[in-house]
Structure formats: structure tokens, C-alpha cells
């Protein structure tokens, strides 16, 4: 029987006449246009919504737009459009939020075409009250703000400048000219790259990379010939124009640019291009693109330095710079990642790594699915998900996968089951262990999103009809309850739930079907009475992570340690509630070569843990560039995975020496470096 | 500035058929309801037919029900209006109209419909 | 059917006099979302309807504030406080609250 459907799934209580007490409709007093939607800060219950239209005239678009304010997650709206002198906001710069809970917001103006700059409305008491500030230059790119200091704003002009407001806004300065790129780093420093000649474009590869440290008072140029930067966890990247030819190298930093590693990742050509698809403190995932226009590359992770990198995964989807790659974080497991490989008969399948990209594997078939007209065996195939490329593509998959990480090991995804992904309308499967096992959890596309960290999954059909049902479960999609949200159907837009899963209220958003005006109506549905009362000791059980052998005195390893999850039984109709904290017991484990990474100059023979060296090294010295010196590394093949905890067992050896000799391959060393004051 | 303009209307026979089309312009057409009113020889009003912002759902009096059909295409900014079974009391001028809090906001300036032997 | 009876029929006027023309229905156009469907329309001579007032007493755009609208459930007042040339030709009352739409008869505003 179809999920949901089973004999024993218990109905929850009374819900309908619960839900109905707890939902909130409002309607916008605003023609149908665009909308968009800001939560102002944690816990605080501040939506702003932007809804903005557009009325074609005869030679020009006018716009107009209105604001709202809710301060109890959704459930009422004040139009607040007069707090900003009912101003037309431009949408393309969103609503620039403050980081953490600093109540700061910035909107954008539109502002006539002979102006002498930008406009735009400052808020620090969580848009409570607005301050109207006329800007001496156009911007460009929405407001960043430093991650350290919500009082430090920069942003790009028209004319490529880099301007920084050190007072929120209140007051600007021109810090540099012919900027291409400007990014916060840490400690409010800020990197930006500059073109000498004509401009960005022009100068692509010639580049220079600077670093200011006081906010613009003094500078350093910290690389030359640069094609691009980026910022991952604790690592500065930068790729790199090479002396002789049209390729680019990726160098690394761990001390804002101080000095350079050249990382020992293929060079590229014109066409091809570099990607961090994920980092941290500890590594980085980088994906480098194949040759010609193929759609794919090569996934590599990163040693500790991000300096030594190993093969993870051949044939990675990603389709052009700035494409679409799968490649997708579960962040309700650690160490999970899952993505999209380009099969050589050109069909694409979902490969899934436990290990940080240690090694990858396909998902395993769903116990209540049969293949589909992919699988060439009807009994032996794979669970393929949907991501983004999916949705670039078209397909009638509504949503990207979903996981957060209070909601320990649940994952949702649209999929198909076969023996690659399918064009076919796709079901919605959901995970409970982290990717390791999979069930169909809903028939056809829907919108899902996860209240109270994994209490309640909620649910709307994707359909091009209106709509005015919901579904929900409270037992991590194995049954679910059907609620009709109003009597009128609307065309739903979209879900909205506080970031961070904590939540129980979700918003649906839509647009009325009417016979008058279409007009933007968001229903805002309260679920605390579904879960009456908080959950206490019992409702939770052990869950070991990662669990595969239960026999296995190591089951449950990963990256050197294992942990033990207190989570929610499925039976428990209760409230994990907005204070909850994920509980787990990490116990480090014994190193085994599943712990170590083969190092630099060795790769490991697929379903072999042991690593060799590649052919074509054999014999020779394994020399590499390190901080603009040549070390040399006497290694018999590993090194520890980086984040690796394990203690004892097989401990491989590995030694670096510093040759002492100067790297010519290396495109700055200290030396070279020069600073500048203002 | 809203536009709509009619077209289609002709002499026909009893019982024939004919298809009344509105070019909008000027406004985003897929937010608003619509409708059809004709003005009768002797100057009275009649709405004739009516359809909602997306082409859902439909609405006509009893004296229309079964013989006519409005439709609409957002993608084109058009509405239609799809006549059989004509009598000679459906003879006039049919308006298309744009509606917005209220109704019949917007009027074209007509095409006149003579059903006659 | 909602009958919308309109009086007078012809309303003989002078210009720069007031003018009123009343409007009644056979049910409440009160609707169940408390708001009220029924709006004034100007035809003036070789030309299509024109709405100057809907949901009672708000004015289109573009229209003078001469003219006012009241009224509540079942009965209907357009009031124009100094009749203008411009303002010569048939009114019609209409509802909205009940299908079908129905339409008043007209009053022709003539002059005098």
C-alpha cells in the first residue's frame, strides 16, 4: 500500500479542528508581482516581506512595491511601505539582512536616472523604524556585511568601486578604484581583486589580489595574474594565469595571503574552471573541470593545508561555470555528501559518500520501490535523487534534497529508482539514517520542509492546478494527515519555515484565483497542538550513526570516531521544542586505513583500501611546493583524513623535509609581497 | 494605460457560431478577472460571461449557459468568447471588461454581434 | 435574479445644479466578506460604459470628486453636486455580490 496508507498508522487526534484554530490568513493588499520574504534574526518571529509589480507602459515599466512586517512568525502582517516613504525597493538586491541576531537590515532603492547615487533605508531595531540615507555612489551589489561587525558595510559601485561604511551605512567612503570582486574574510578583513587596464573582463588573469586589514587605511597585494579567489572555511584560494601558457593553477593560503601553496590540483585551460564545492576548517572539496565542453570534472578533497589533494570522485557532474553540479551536503549526517556522476552513455547517476569523500557508492533501492524503466535488472538498481541540475533542467522536481542538522540523519529528496536518474515524474523518498537506507515517503513532486528539528514533515503537492490541502506526519514520513488549509484554493508559490528546522509554523504562500484581482494570501499554520505536550526522556532512543554492522566492534566509525544520537522515536507525538539540543556521544575509534587518505604521488585501486603509487611517479623523488619552498616527502602512502579523530592501530609513517630550495613553480613568495598605505 | 480591443463580431445565422476575441495591453492580464457584457439593441446591459485571473473557473447566466464559452490566453493577453446556438436576442455589442477590486473596471469599445435570417 | 430598479428614468438637469439618481436591489448586496458589490457606470453618447464609482462610494481614477456614491444594503445614491456637460448621458447601477451580474435600466441625465 501506498505510504501513509498502512493499517497501523495511528491518526493524530482531533488535528483539524487543532489546525484550524491555529491557522492565519492574510490577505495583501497588492496585485500579484513578485514577493520575497527575510526572516530578521533567530527566534525573534520578524518576517519581512517585499512584494514588488511591475506595470508595462507604453515605452517604460513602472514599479511599485510595499513592505510588511509580521513579529509572530507570519501569522499577522503590517504594511509598514510608509516607513520607507513608500519608496519602489529593487528586488535584484533582495532585503540585505544583518548576520546573527543584530536586527540590521538595508533595502535598496530605486532612484531616478539622474541621480548623483543610490538610495537606501537602514534598519537596526529589527525594521521596526527606517533611516532614508542617500548614497555618494550607485551600487552595484547588494550590502555585505562583515560577519565580525554588522557595522561594517561594503558594497561595489556601478563604476567598479569599493566603498565601506564603518557606521552602518550612515556614512561612506570610496576605499579603491577598479575592483572586480570584494569578500569579507575573517577579522572585518576584506580581499578584492583589481584590474590595472580596461576592466574586469579585460584583465581576467591579470588580476591583482589585495587585502586590507583596517577597513581601507592601508592595503596589501597578496597576488598578481589572478583569474579568481574565493573563500573557503579557513582557506584563501586563488586561481592563478601560469608564465608560459593560458592555464590557471588554484594556490592556497591559511594566513590571508601572507603565503601561497600551489595546490597539487590539474592546471586548467581557458574553457575549464575551478569549483570549492564545500569546505571547512578542516578541508575542502574542490571540483575541477574536465577538458572540452564534456559537462563534467573531478571531485578532489584536500589534506588539512588544502595543499594535497586526492582523487574523490571521476565523471562528477557540473555542467559550465557557474552550471549546475548536484554536488549536496547532508547536514543531518556527518561526513555525507551525495551528488551526480555523467555516466559514459551520458545518463546521470546519484552516488553517495559517508566518509567525506573517502569513497562514493550508489544509494541503496528503496525496500518499497521497483525499478523503473531505467534498470536494465528489475532487480538490482539504484535510488537516483534530484537536485539542482533537475531543476535546471526542468523536470517536475519542485525542490532541491533537504536535511538539516537538528534533525539528525532525515533526508528528503525527490528520486526515481532504476539504473540512473529518470525524466519520468519523480517520488518523494526520505532517508531516516543519513543516506543509508531510503523509503518512498510521498507519490509525485511535492514541497517539503521540516518543523520542531524532525517532529513534524510537512508537505504540498506540486501541481499546476491551485491548491488548499497540506500534508503532515509526526513520525518522519511514514504516515501522513491531510489538512485543507481553506476553502478557496490558491496557487501556491511557496513554503516558508524559520531557518534552522526549530520552528512550528509554516507559511504557504500563494496567489488567489479570482475573479476580480489576483492577489498575494500567505496561510500561516501553527502546529503546537498537534504536538500537546513537550517530550520528556522516554520518547527518545539510542541511535548509533553510520550503523552498518551492528556485530562489528567498529560499526558506526567514520573519520576516526563514532557517535550515539538520542532521537525521537517515530511512535512520540511530542515537542522537541525551540530550545532543543541534539544529543550525542562521540567515542573515538582505532585507525585503520579507512582513516587515511593516500597521499601525494599514491591512489587506491577502487574497492581496495591500500594505496599505491601512481605508475608514473615510481621511483621518484616526491618532491611539491610548499609556502614558496620545495619540501620532500618520504611517505609509504597515507595521510590522515583531515578531521580524522582515530587513535592508535595502523599507523602509517610520513615525514616531510624542506629541500631548502626555492619553488619556481610558485607565483609569490614573501619577498615578493608589497604594502600600501592610504 | 489599459487596453482592450475587440474583435470578431459579424452578421450570422440562427443557430451559427462565432468567436469574439480582447487584445489587453497596458496591464499584466493574467492577475485580473475578466468578463464579457453586451448592450443590447435598446441600450440595456447584460453580462454575458465571466472567467478568473488564471482561466480556472467560469461563470455565465442561466440565458447564455451551454451555448457560450469564455476563455483566455494568458501567454497571448487575449480572452475569447466562444458563441453557438445564436438567437436573435443575443444580438448587440459585446464589450470585453477588465475587473479589479470590484467589477467591469475596464471597458473596450465593443463588436457589434447581429444574429438575423 | 437581483432586480436593480433605477429612478428616475430621465433626469432633466441644469448645468452647474445638483443632480441625484437612485438605485435600488431586490436583496442585500451586503456579501459574506463584509464588503459591498455595487458600482455606477457613465455612458455617454457614441461611446462604451465607463465605471466611475464600485463597492459603493470609491472613486475610479480620473473622476471628479463632483460625484459621490452612498448607500448600504439595499439602497443606492449617486449624487453629482454640479452637473457639467461632460457628465450628460445614460447611468447604470450594477451588483456584484450575486450571480448573475445584473445591470439597472439607466437614467439618462439630459439637460433641462
Known amino acids: 500500500s501506498a505510504p501513509g496508507e498502512d493499517e497501523e498508522c495511528g491518526r493524530v487526534r482531533d488535528f483539524v479542528a487543532k489546525l484550524a484554530n491555529n491557522t492565519h490568513q492574510h490577505v495583501f493588499d497588492d496585485l500579484r508581482g513578485s514577493v520575497s520574504l527575510s526572516w530578521v534574526g533567530d527566534s525573534t518571529g520578524v518576517i519581512l516581506v517585499l512584494t514588488t509589480f511591475h506595470v508595462p507602459l507604453v515605452i517604460m515599466t513602472f514599479g511599485q512595491s510595499k513592505l510588511y512586517r509580521s513579529e509572530d512568525y507570519g501569522k499577522n502582517f503590517k504594511d509598514i511601505t510608509d516607513l520607507i516613504n513608500n519608496t519602489f525597493i529593487r528586488t535584484e538586491f533582495g532585503m540585505a539582512i544583518g548576520p546573527e541576531n543584530s536586527g540590521k537590515v538595508v533595502l535598496t532603492a530605486e532612484v531616478s536616472g539622474g541621480s548623483r547615487g543610490g538610495r537606501i533605508f537602514r534598519s537596526s531595531d529589527f525594521a521596526k523604524n527606517f533611516v532614508q540615507t542617500d548614497l555618494p555612489f550607485h551600487p552595484l551589489t547588494q550590502m555585505m556585511y562583515s560577519p565580525q561587525n554588522s557595522d561594517y558595510l561594503l558594497a561595489l559601485s556601478t563604476e567598479n568601486g569599493l566603498w565601506v561604511s564603518k557606521n552602518f551605512g550612515g556614512k561612506w567612503e570610496e576605499i579603491h578604484k577598479a575592483v572586480c570582486l570584494a569578500k569579507w574574510g575573517s577579522d572585518n578583513t576584506i580581499f578584492f581583486t583589481t584590474y590595472a587596464n580596461g576592466s574586469c573582463k579585460a584583465d581576467l588573469g591579470a588580476l591583482e589580489l589585495w587585502r586590507t586589514s583596517d577597513l581601507g587605511k592601508s592595503f596589501k597585494t597578496i597576488g598578481v595574474k589572478i583569474y579568481s579567489f574565493g573563500l573557503g572555511g579557513r582557506f584563501l584560494f586563488a586561481s592563478v594565469m601560469a608564465d608560459k601558457d593560458t592555464t590557471r593553477r588554484i594556490h592556497v593560503s591559511t594566513d590571508q595571503g601572507d603565503t601561497w601553496s600551489m595546490a597539487q590540483l590539474p592546471s586548467v585551460g581557458q574553457e575549464q574552471f575551478y569549483s570549492i564545492l564545500a569546505a571547512n576548517d578542516d578541508m575542502v572539496f574542490m571540483h575541477v573541470d574536465e577538458p572540452g565542453d564534456t559537462g563534467f570534472g573531478t571531485i578532489f578533497t584536500s589534506d588539512d593545508r588544502g595543499i594535497v589533494y586526492s582523487k574523490s570522485l571521476d565523471r562528477h557532474l557540473y555542467t559550465t561555470t557557474g552550471g549546475e553540479t548536484d554536488f549536496t551536503n547532508v547536514t543531518s549526517l556527518r561526513g555525507v555528501y551525495i551528488t551526480s556522476v555523467l555516466s559514459e552513455d551520458n545518463s546521470i547517476q546519484t552516488m553517495i559518500t559517508f566518509d567525506q569523500g573517502g569513497r562514493w557508492t550508489h544509494l541503496r533501492k528503496p525496500e518499497n520501490s521497483e525499478c523503473d524503466a531505467t534498470a536494465k535488472n528489475k532487480n538490482e538498481c539504484s535510488l537516483h535523487i534530484h537536485a539542482s541540475y533537475s531543476i535546471s533542467q526542468k523536470l517536475n522536481v519542485p525542490m532541491a534534497p533537504l536535511s538539516e542538522p537538528n534533525a539528525v540523519g532525515i533526508v528528503i529528496a525527490h528520486g526515481s529508482v532504476g539504473d540512473a536518474i529518470s525524466v519520468m515524474v519523480p517520488d518523494v523518498y526520505i532517508s531516516d539514517d543519513g543516506g543509508y537506507s531510503w523509503t518512498k515517503m510521498l507519490e509525485g513532486p511535492h514541497y517539503y520542509t521540516i518543523l520542531d528539528s524532525g517532529g513534524i514533515i510537512v508537505a504540498i503537492e506540486h501541481s499546476s492546478r491551485p491548491i488548499n490541502v497540506i500534508k503532515f506526519s509526526t513520525d518522519e514520513g511514514q504516515c501522513w494527515q491531510t489538512y485543507t488549509f481553506t476553502r478557496d484554493p490558491i496557487y501556491f508559490t511557496g513554503l516558508a519555515s524559520e531557518p534552522g528546522a526549530r520552528s512550528m509554523n509554516i507559511s504557504i504562500w500563494g496567489f488567489t484565483e479570482s475573479f476580480l484581482t489576483s492577489q498575494w494570501v500567505s496561510y500561516t499554520i501553527d502546529f503546537k497542538d498537534i504536538l500537546e505536550r513537550n517530550c520528556e526522556e522516554k520518547d527518545y532512543t539510542i541511535w548509533l550513526a553510520h550503523s552498518t554492522d551492528p556485530e562489528d566492534y567498529e560499526d558506526g566509525c567514520i573519520l576516526g570516531y563514532k557517535e550515539q544520537f538520542l532521537r525521537l522515536r517515530k511512535s512520540s507525538v511530542c515537542q522537541n521544542g525551540r530550545d532543543y539540543v541534539v544529543t550525542k556521544q562521540p567515542s573515538i575509534c582505532l585507525c585503520s586505513l579507512e582513516d587515511f587518505l593516500c597521499d601525494f604521488g599514491y591512489y587506491r585501486p577502487e574497492n581496495d583500501s591500500k594505496c599505491v603509487e601512481q605508475p608514473e611517479l615510481k621511483g621518484h623523488d616526491l618532491e611539491f611546493c610548499l609556502y614558496g619552498r620545495e619540501e620532500h616527502l618520504t611517505t609509504n602512502g597515507y595521510r590522515k583524513i583531515p578531521g580524522d579523530k582515530c587513535q592508535g592501530g595502523v599507523n602509517p609513517v610520513r615525514e616531510v623535509k624542506d629541500l631548502k630550495k626555492k619553488c619556481t613553480s610558485n607565483f609569490l613568495s614573501p619577498e615578493k609581497q608589497n604594502s600600501k598605505s592610504n | 494605460e489599459v487596453h482592450l480591443v475587440e474583435s470578431g463580431g459579424d452578421l450570422v445565422n440562427p443557430g451559427g457560431s462565432l468567436k469574439l476575441s480582447c487584445e489587453a495591453s497596458?496591464?499584466?492580464?493574467?492577475?485580473?478577472?475578466m468578463s464579457w457584457v453586451r448592450q443590447t439593441p435598446d441600450k440595456r446591459l447584460e453580462w454575458v460571461a465571466m472567467?478568473?485571473?488564471?482561466?480556472?473557473?467560469?461563470q455565465y447566466p442561466d440565458s447564455v449557459k451551454g451555448r457560450f464559452t469564455i476563455s483566455r490566453d494568458n501567454a497571448k493577453n487575449t480572452l475569447y468568447l466562444q458563441m453557438s446556438g445564436l438567437k436573435s436576442e443575443d444580438t448587440g455589442t459585446y464589450h470585453c471588461?477588465?475587473?479589479?477590486?470590484?467589477?467591469?473596471?475596464?471597458w473596450g469599445q465593443g463588436t457589434l454581434v447581429t444574429v438575423s435570417a | 435574479d437581483v432586480v436593480m430598479t433605477q429612478t428616475p428614468l430621465t433626469l432633466s438637469v441644469t448645468i452647474g445644479q445638483p443632480a441625484s439618481i437612485s438605485c435600488k436591489s431586490s436583496?442585500?448586496?451586503?456579501?459574506?466578506?463584509?464588503?459591498?458589490?455595487l458600482n455606477w457606470l457613465l455612458q455617454r453618447p457614441g461611446q462604451s460604459p465607463k465605471r466611475l464609482i464600485y463597492?459603493?462610494?470609491k472613486l475610479d481614477s480620473g473622476v471628479p470628486d463632483r460625484f459621490t456614491g452612498s448607500g448600504s444594503g439595499t439602497d443606492f445614491t449617486l449624487r453629482i453636486s454640479r452637473v457639467e456637460a461632460e457628465d450628460l448621458g445614460v447611468y447604470y447601477c450594477c451588483q456584484g455580490t450575486h450571480f448573475p451580474l445584473t445591470f439597472g435600466a439607466g437614467t439618462k441625465l439630459e439637460l433641462k
Open positions: 463597492l459603493v462610494s
Open positions: 472567467i478568473s485571473s488564471g482561466g480556472i473557473y467560469t
Open positions: 436583496q442585500s448586496l451586503l456579501d459574506s466578506n463584509g464588503k459591498t458589490y
Open positions: 471588461t477588465r475587473h479589479d477590486d470590484s467589477w467591469f473596471a475596464y
Open positions: 497596458g496591464f499584466i492580464f493574467s492577475i485580473y478577472g
